[in-house]
């Protein structure tokens, strides 16, 4: 008997859908694997006789439940199939947005860039997929624990009237209010404000 693949799971970020599994212990030799997806009631091969322990399903439609399966093979023998279901639009992880930060006196000017999508035009981003797409921003004074959160209305935001000559850290994530689903935070960007622009009277 060939044992089935273990720990079969979908790793999907921004619709880059990678089915992953682990090779089971097998004394007779090296196993190969075949992964398939259900299409119009028929299973279609996606990765055949591969020695890898992953298979790229990024070309699946973003909508709907997909049934995927993988099995292990050795010579003329094979394991049972291991099935999983996966709905890309519901299950994909929202990766961190990009962010540009510029200091202007005692203000931080931020511009946000929605994550790009696998197998899409450059300009078609996560914001196009999810109608309710918005950003959460959190910022804090470097070296302190207190964090402040804001929800910008647009793809940019300005933090004004900050303390001069102080380093602030900022990070951003995508958020879908209608699904109450949050994405991954971007890496913090830390910038030091300069002088207070107010002119003494």
């Amino acid at each position: 008997m060939v044992p089935p693949p273990e720990n079969v799971r979908m790793n999907s970020v921004n619709f880059k859908n990678i089915l992953q599994w682990e090779s089971p212990a097998f004394a007779k030799g090296n196993l190969t694997f075949t992964a398939q997806y259900l299409s119009y009631r028929i299973f279609q091969d996606k990765c055949m006789n591969t020695t890898l322990t992953e298979c790229d399903f990024s070309s699946l439609s973003k909508y709907g439940d997909h049934t995927l399966r993988v099995r292990a093979e050795f010579a003329d023998e094979h394991s049972d199939w291991v099935n999983i279901t996966f709905c890309p639009v519901d299950d994909t992880i929202i990766g961190p947005p990009g962010m540009q930060v510029e200091v202007l006196a005692d203000s931080l000017h931020m511009r946000f860039l929605a994550p790009k999508i696998e197998n899409e035009y450059e300009t078609w981003t996560m914001k196009n997929v999810y109608n309710s797409w918005t950003y959460n921003v959190q910022y804090w004074k470097n070296g302190t624990d207190e964090k402040f959160q804001i929800t910008p209305q647009y793809d940019f935001e300005v933090l004004r009237n900050l303390e001069p000559w102080t380093t602030y850290c900022v990070q951003v994530r995508g958020f879908l209010p209608d699904r109450n689903k949050a994405g991954e935070w971007s890496e913090p960007v830390c910038e030091q404000t300069t002088h207070d622009e107010t002119v003494p009277s």
Partner: nanobody, 124 residues
């Protein structure tokens, strides 16, 4: 059943222009995303462009950016693909497709209805 009908294809010299049209026969072309695809002889289906109904945004393959323009006329229920500066490598059957859910733009898997296609040949 929605039927998409493409028209406007033909034979054109390199550097020339064509305007393709996509209409829904007997129905409104009221879908979140309408896309254009093409298939060159002996090759797979390639995404060319799409237009989103929600915000009117337009999106293009790198190979046609700056030469092709997608637009829609809601009063005529028609989507157009204006193709300028045509090249021999643009020769293909061009298909219009409509998406029910509007989640994708470039991948044919994200589209639900397809036209029969119109032939575009660029040759001197």
């Amino acid at each position: 059943e929605v039927q998409l009908v493409e028209s406007g294809g033909g034979l054109v010299q390199p550097g020339g222009s064509l305007r393709l049209s996509c209409a829904a026969s007997g129905n409104s072309l009221d879908y979140p995303t309408i896309g254009w695809f093409r298939q060159a002889p002996g090759k797979g289906l390639e995404g060319v462009s799409c237009i989103s109904a929600s915000d009117g945004s337009t999106h293009y393959a790198d190979s046609v950016k700056g030469r092709f323009t997608i637009s829609r006329d809601n009063s005529k229920n028609t989507v157009y693909l204006q193709m300028n500066s045509l090249r021999a490598e643009d020769t293909a059957v061009y298909y219009c497709a409509a998406s029910l859910y509007g989640l994708g733009c470039k991948s044919e898997a994200d589209y639900d209805y397809w036209g029969q296609g119109t032939q575009v040949t660029v040759s001197s």
